[in-house]
């Protein structure tokens, strides 16, 4: 997946620093207080959909083949989304106000692709 | 996830019949020749992003919190994408022209959500 570097408008991964204090989640998340979560942005021209590493590869590739031939679904926009996310350990208060440490999936965007 | 029924413009699953013959893939895919692969379409207003069943839940929820507060990344569109895909068995010619049967992931869109 591409890294956003200011020189491309194609689907890429933008570094993004998340601070739980800014969104008021520091009242239940103990650690980390912040981390690089990143996000995906950019355009998804037809040729980028369904390439290796793209989201839901087989299905995306099939739908893209339909689009390239001018067949339905032609109006659905291809979308720049996370294709690889990673897990991070988090220390937080659970529903019963116990402090717990858990591996939380889908916290960090590692790669982006066109769905 | 919502099913598209012609009455909603929100992110939903649209039934879609895929015929490999129409895209010229019948030269390597033996069976099935066609199937319901479906696709996702519709709008993703802010309140729909990061709800249970949406894509990449934790990360989506965090980014959505930033957006709701007018913080970056505010310009990135939320996107209606598959949140649940299923596997299907496929009989096809491999690289050495042997006929093989495999479970192919991500063939069928089962549910859609906002990323």
């Amino acid at each position: 997946g591409l890294e956003c570097d200011g020189r491309t408008n194609l689907c890429c991964r933008q570094q993004f620093f998340i601070d739980f204090r800014l969104i008021g989640w520091n009242d239940w998340i103990i650690a980390p207080t912040s981390y690089y979560g990143n996000y995906c942005e950019g355009s998804c021209p037809a040729y980028l959909a369904g390439v290796p590493g793209s989201a839901s590869s087989f299905h995306t590739a099939v739908v893209n083949q339909y689009r390239m031939r001018g067949l339905n679904p032609g109006t659905v926009n291809s979308c720049c989304i996370p294709t690889k996310l990673s897990t991070m350990s988090m220390l937080y208060f659970d529903d019963e106000y116990n402090i717990v440490k858990r591996d939380v999936p889908n916290m960090i965007v590692e790669e982006c692709g066109c769905a | 996830g919502l099913e598209c029924d012609g009455r909603t413009n929100l992110c939903c699953r649209q039934q879609f019949f895929i015929d490999f013959r129409l895209i010229g893939w019948n030269d390597w895919i033996i069976a099935p020749t066609s199937y319901y692969g479906n696709y996702c379409e519709g709008s993703c207003p802010a309140y729909l992003a990061g709800v249970p069943g949406s894509a990449s839940s934790f990360h989506t929820a965090v980014v959505n919190q930033y957006r709701m507060r007018g913080l970056n990344p505010g310009t990135v569109n939320s996107c209606c994408i598959p949140t649940k895909l299923s596997t299907m068995s496929m009989l096809y010619f491999d690289d050495e022209y042997n006929i093989v049967k495999r479970d192919v992931p991500n063939m069928i869109v089962e549910e859609c959500g906002c990323a």
Epitope: - | N26, I30, A31, S89, N98, V100, K101, D103
Partner: antibody, heavy 117, light 107 residues
Framework: QVQLVESGGGVVQPGRSLRLSCVAS????????IHWVRQAPGKGLEWVSV????????DYADSVKGRFTISRDNSKNTVYLEMKGLRAEDTALYYC??????????WGQGTLVTVSS | DIQMTQSPSSLSASVGDRVTITCRAS??????LSWYQQKPGKAPKFLIY???SIQSGAPSRFSGSGSGTDFTLTISSLQPEDFATYYC?????????FGQGTKLEIK
């Protein structure tokens, strides 16, 4: 309902030819793969050949490759097995069967081929 | 080619018995295994596919399990009409191959 009926079997001398037919009803052969499977007297099942959905792709067991040819006539909803250079070891009950992604979900009653001098 | 080996080759049992037939593949075939029942003078009948999915119309006393190389067909309570020969078959790759069969006889 789905039905497959084989015909064309009989007694034939070694080296001679025979053509088996498999007439389908209840479905169209152009939408399914059709296999031939044989069973020698008192023995197990042996896959012989298949003609796939598009009619272009065909496959054969090594034991019959170069001698047997599978074909299809969509207008007659029929699949054929042309058998040339028959040998004693080809003696068997020949079944046609409908494909279900490499499995066989419907079978005919079979037609007996006896190769004997 | 993938070799399929069934055991036992023959088996005697009584009505009401629980019976298990095994099938072993010479290499990993995931769960792409089917079972067929054949009665004397009749064509085989499709019973189970994908190792454990029961074919429409097959009695629920038949069940299948296994993946990789080792598979079993189980009849939970033998009925008089179940005495027949059973074949396993792999659909993982062509040529599609059968086991040699297991003949189930009345004790």
């Amino acid at each position: 309902q789905v039905q497959l009926v084989e015909s064309g079997g009989g007694v034939v001398q070694p080296g001679r030819s025979l053509r088996l037919s498999c007439v389908a009803s209840g479905f169209t052969v152009s939408s399914y793969g059709i296999h031939w499977v044989r069973q020698a007297p008192g023995k197990g099942l042996e896959w012989v050949s298949v003609i796939w959905y598009d009619g272009r792709n065909k496959d054969y067991a090594d034991s019959v490759k170069g001698r047997f040819t599978i074909s299809r006539d969509n207008s007659k909803n029929t699949v054929y097995l042309e058998m040339k250079g028959l040998r004693a070891e080809d003696t068997a009950l020949y079944y046609c069967a409908r494909d279900k992604t490499g499995d066989f979900d419907s079978w005919g009653q079979g037609t007996l081929v006896t190769v004997s001098s | 080619d993938i070799q399929m080996t069934q055991s036992p080759s023959s088996l005697s049992a009584s009505v009401g018995d629980r019976v298990t037939i095994t099938c072993r593949a010479s290499q990993n075939i995931n769960s792409f295994l089917s079972w067929y029942q054949q009665k004397p003078g009749k064509a085989p009948k499709f019973l189970i596919y994908d190792a454990s999915s029961i074919q429409s119309g097959a009695p629920s006393r038949f069940s299948g399990s296994g993946s990789g190389t080792d598979f079993t067909l189980t009849i939970s309570s033998l009925q008089p009409e179940d005495f027949a020969t059973y074949y396993c078959q792999q659909s993982y790759s062509s040529p599609f191959t059968f086991g040699q069969g297991t003949k189930l006889e009345i004790k």
